[in-house]
Interface confidence: medium
């Protein structure tokens, strides 16, 4: 039989988690005891393997999707905030599909 994992709905205010501690806080919402969280003590990768990932920006961990992103400084853009823009935060989509 297939094991159906309990659903843990992402907290509505966690679209972009800005946790900086090693242990991201996780609200137990929806799933019984949060059973689908296999790795309960997963470290924030921004403090580990992605520590130097963002060139001109700050690493952010989107906890409920286990995804890392970069919050760029004002004049920079790109996946790693490595490209400089002439216009402040103009949305340049040409490099979106990596």
């Amino acid at each position: 039989s297939v094991r159906v994992e309990q659903v843990v709905k992402p907290p509505q205010n966690k679209t972009e988690s800005e946790n900086t501690s090693d242990k991201p806080k996780r609200k137990k919402k929806g799933g019984k005891n949060g059973k689908n969280r296999r790795n309960r003590k997963k470290k924030n990768p921004c403090n580990a393997e992605f520590q130097n990932f963002c060139i001109h920006g700050e690493c952010k961990y989107i906890e409920h999707l286990e995804a890392v992103t970069c919050k760029c400084q004002q004049e920079y853009f790109g996946e790693r905030c490595g490209e400089k823009s002439m216009k402040t935060h103009s949305m340049i989509d040409s490099s979106l599909s990596k």
């Epitope: 994992e5 659903v7 843990v8 709905k9 992402p10 509505q12 205010n13 679209t15 972009e16 689908n36 969280r37 296999r38 790795n39 997963k42 920006g57 700050e58 952010k60 989107i62 409920h64 999707l65 286990e66 995804a67 890392v68 992103t69 970069c70 919050k71 760029c72 853009f77 996946e79 935060h89 949305m91 979106l96 599909s97 990596k98």
Partner: antibody, heavy 124, light 112 residues
Framework: EVQLVESGGGLVKPGGSLRLSCAAS????????MSWVRQAPGKGLEWVST????????YYPDSVKGRFTISRDNAKNSLYLQMNSLRAEDTAVYYC?????????????????WGQGTTVTVSS | DIVMTQSPLSLPVTLGQPASISCRSS???????????LHWYQQRPGQSPKLLIY???NRFSGVPDRFSGSGSGTDFTLKISRVEAEDVGVYYC?????????FGGGTKVEIK
Amino acid sequence: EVQLVESGGGLVKPGGSLRLSCAASGFTFSSYPMSWVRQAPGKGLEWVSTISTGGTYTYYPDSVKGRFTISRDNAKNSLYLQMNSLRAEDTAVYYCARQGPIYYGNYYYAMDYWGQGTTVTVSS
Amino acid sequence: DIVMTQSPLSLPVTLGQPASISCRSSQSLVHSDGNTYLHWYQQRPGQSPKLLIYKVSNRFSGVPDRFSGSGSGTDFTLKISRVEAEDVGVYYCSQSTHVPYTFGGGTKVEIK
């Protein structure tokens, strides 16, 4: 070039099971959450499930909760949807879609690339 | 669940003329992080959906600038400044501010 190719669809009887697969290429699969979306014949789009990059978190609407299970194998660049206790209303084209990308520090949750879909028909 | 209501259901347009599609949500789509996760997709006949606009007004890669999105809160609009033959298809709005993610019923754009 981002490519998503679904497979595993077919004709199944009510109460039966089916496992859909999605082979991804052209991007770093393990860095992106992934989703399944379906479209019943002549109808609109319905979100079916989303899985986080490492597979730790899975999300479903009530219509499939307890019957469908999303999973992924990052080593194989593959996404799966195990569908059990299938009903006639599950008949649809099932699309695999990438959630992303992560850009400008704003994760915008849009499904930016979609596969061509695989057809699931539930009928006796 | 958030209900997304699109109008009109069908939109016959003349080539070169503008077109406008409305999308209303049953609740505000403003997330607590300040973003509004409202997106628009295009589905041409016989094809899979494609992302057009994300977060209300941002054109996705390769999308022509004749497409634009606007709106806030619960009311949103997709505009095509000059409709071309390749724009024929069904357009869907979608929200991902709240789980479950939901789509509008679609608006079919066809040439008069």
